[in-house]
């Protein structure tokens, strides 16, 4: 039960995270005009990865796309790339994890396949989350650098007569959305990896041994022994009887060639 919960929760957390990464990537508020210690302007500027916008005091908003590829800063291109890679990996991870979910039955898919898929999706989510966090952090660093550069020469002009106030930009809402979303995707990925360990079918030592009792001949099925795999290991190799009901997350022993003597 715990494995299913961990896997399901990991999936949901990653799903929310990836939705957040997509939202952050599409948002226009990656950087917003710094209003602190600035003259009160009737115009508010904010910028995204794909376009820059201006909102006037009248409520009129005008956005202009960055229609050039070569003219854009390399850092912005890098951030775009990181976010897109994060989205693509996350989307593939979600697709893989849907089929890996224990609660979904697809034909006669074995637990080992589901475990592998869970691990794959988990790694994808981790990388996706890291891409988003890296992208947002690179952009934030770029903003901080530009902020202090523009603060250093806040006022430029001719002989001090005419002043030009440089627009300074600070962190926009998209950065926080991106950081949180990246973190959630990362956590979701870790949860999927943890769930994978519980899903992995344990290696069974298939050494069929016949024990001849004095009276009747009884063949013990090696499938009833819990092999030592490292997770919940049964080192004493005690016989585990299948008399009681089992939860879905307990390691199931599927029929093997040795089960039928």
């Amino acid at each position: 039960m715990a494995v299913t919960a961990c896997q399901g929760l990991g999936f949901v957390v990653s799903l929310i995270g990836i939705a957040g990464i997509i939202a952050a990537t599409c948002m226009d508020q990656w950087s917003t005009q710094d209003l602190y210690n600035n003259p009160v302007t009737a115009v508010f500027n904010y910028q995204g990865l794909w376009r820059s916008c201006v909102r006037e005091s009248s409520g009129f908003t005008e956005c202009r796309g960055y229609f050039t590829l070569l003219g854009l800063p390399a850092m912005l291109q890098a951030v775009r790339a990181l976010m897109i890679v994060g989205i693509v990996l996350g989307a593939i991870g979600l697709l893989v994890s849907i089929f890996a979910l224990k609660c979904i039955r697809i034909g006669s898919m074995e637990d080992s396949a589901k475990a592998n898929m869970t691990l794959t999706s988990g790694i994808m989510f981790i990388v996706s989350g890291l891409c988003a966090i890296a992208g947002v952090s690179v952009f934030a660093n770029m903003l901080v650098t530009n902020f202090w550069m523009s603060t250093a020469n806040m006022y430029t002009g001719m002989g001090g007569m005419v002043q030009t106030v440089q627009t300074r930009y600070t962190f926009g809402a998209a950065l926080f959305v991106g950081w949180v979303a990246g973190g959630l995707t990362l956590i979701g990925g870790v949860m999927m990896c943890i769930a994978c360990r519980g899903l992995a079918p344990e290696e069974t030592n298939y050494k069929a041994v016949s024990y001849h009792a004095s009276g009747h001949s009884v063949a013990y099925k090696p499938g009833g022994f819990k092999a030592s795999t490292g997770f919940g290991s049964n080192t004493k190799n005690k016989k585990i009887y299948d008399g009681g009901a089992r939860t879905e997350d307990e390691v199931q022993s599927y029929p093997s060639k040795h089960d039928y003597v």
Epitope: V40, V43, Q47, S57, S58
Partner: antibody, heavy 119, light 113 residues
Framework: DVQLVESGGGLVQPGGSRKLSCGAS????????MHWVRQAPEKGLEWVAY????????HYADIVKGRFTVSRDNPRNTLFLQMTSLGSEDTAIYYC????????????WGQGTSVTVSS | DIVMTQSPSFLTVTAGEKVTMSCRSS????????????LTWYQHKPGQSPKLLIY???TRESGVPDRFTGSGSGTTFTLTISSVQPEDLAVFYC?????????FGSGTKLEIR
């Protein structure tokens, strides 16, 4: 057709108060920011105050700050300018004007209402 | 506050003549975000309400004759009337629409000879 009609002007004693109104019609009043502009006799235009469409933002000229208050009643399509501690320098024709969507310009103006501060 | 300086204060011209008036601001009215200049020109005829002529420094308001042209960027702006008509007798004001307070220039009075 967009129409702005000011009212409430008249003769006021120095130190007195007055409340000007501006009735709007022909447009969705609640969607537009509004301004008050005045013109003293034989002088140029002087910007007085601004109020955003939802009343969340207000700005005033330094000369009227603390004495004048701009407000609006969107359901009644009316803009107000409450003036207190009036002095002779406040004698002017007061215009209300609508803020254009795009350009931050004042695209429609009322005919103005005259306020005279005198003893 | 932003100081708007208009020149000349008075202009006397004959009908059909080309006229140019200027407006200077103490700070740049150019917004880097959209590369627009937040400067507006108004025409105030005697006994009437002011009328919007040009916004964003060079965009003509609908219904305004094309003889009125706005130009300039940053801190220096110009209003040009290509062929003055008798009905153009008015005071022309420039206004800063970028910073609060929205200060006006002192105006340029146009008189027809």
């Amino acid at each position: 057709d967009v129409q702005l009609v000011e009212s409430g002007g008249g003769l006021v004693q120095p130190g007195g108060s007055r409340k000007l109104s501006c009735g709007a019609s022909g447009f969705t009043f609640s969607s537009f920011g509004m301004h008050w502009v005045r013109q003293a006799p034989e002088k140029g235009l002087e910007w007085v105050a601004y109020i955003s469409s939802d009343s969340s933002t207000k700005h005033y000229a330094d000369i009227v700050k603390g004495r004048f208050t701009v407000s609006r009643d969107n359901p009644r399509n009316t803009l107000f300018l409450q003036m207190t501690s009036l002095g002779s320098e406040d004698t002017a024709i007061y215009y209300c004007a609508r803020l254009r969507r795009g350009g931050n310009a004042l695209d429609y103006w009322g005919q103005g209402t005259s306020v005279t501060v005198s003893s | 506050d932003i100081v708007m300086t208009q020149s000349p204060s008075f202009l006397t011209v004959t009908a059909g003549e080309k006229v140019t008036m200027s407006c200077r601001s103490s700070q740049s009215l150019l917004n880097s975000g959209n590369q627009r200049n937040y400067l507006t020109w108004y025409q105030h005829k005697p006994g009437q309400s002011p009328k919007l002529l040009i916004y964003w420094a060079s965009t003509r308001e609908s219904g305004v004759p094309d003889r009125f042209t706005g130009s300039g960027s940053g801190t220096t702006f110009t209003l040009t009337i290509s062929s003055v008509q008798p009905e153009d007798l008015a005071v022309f004001y420039c206004q800063n629409n970028y910073y609060f307070p929205f200060t006006f220039g002192s105006g340029t009075k146009l008189e027809i000879r």
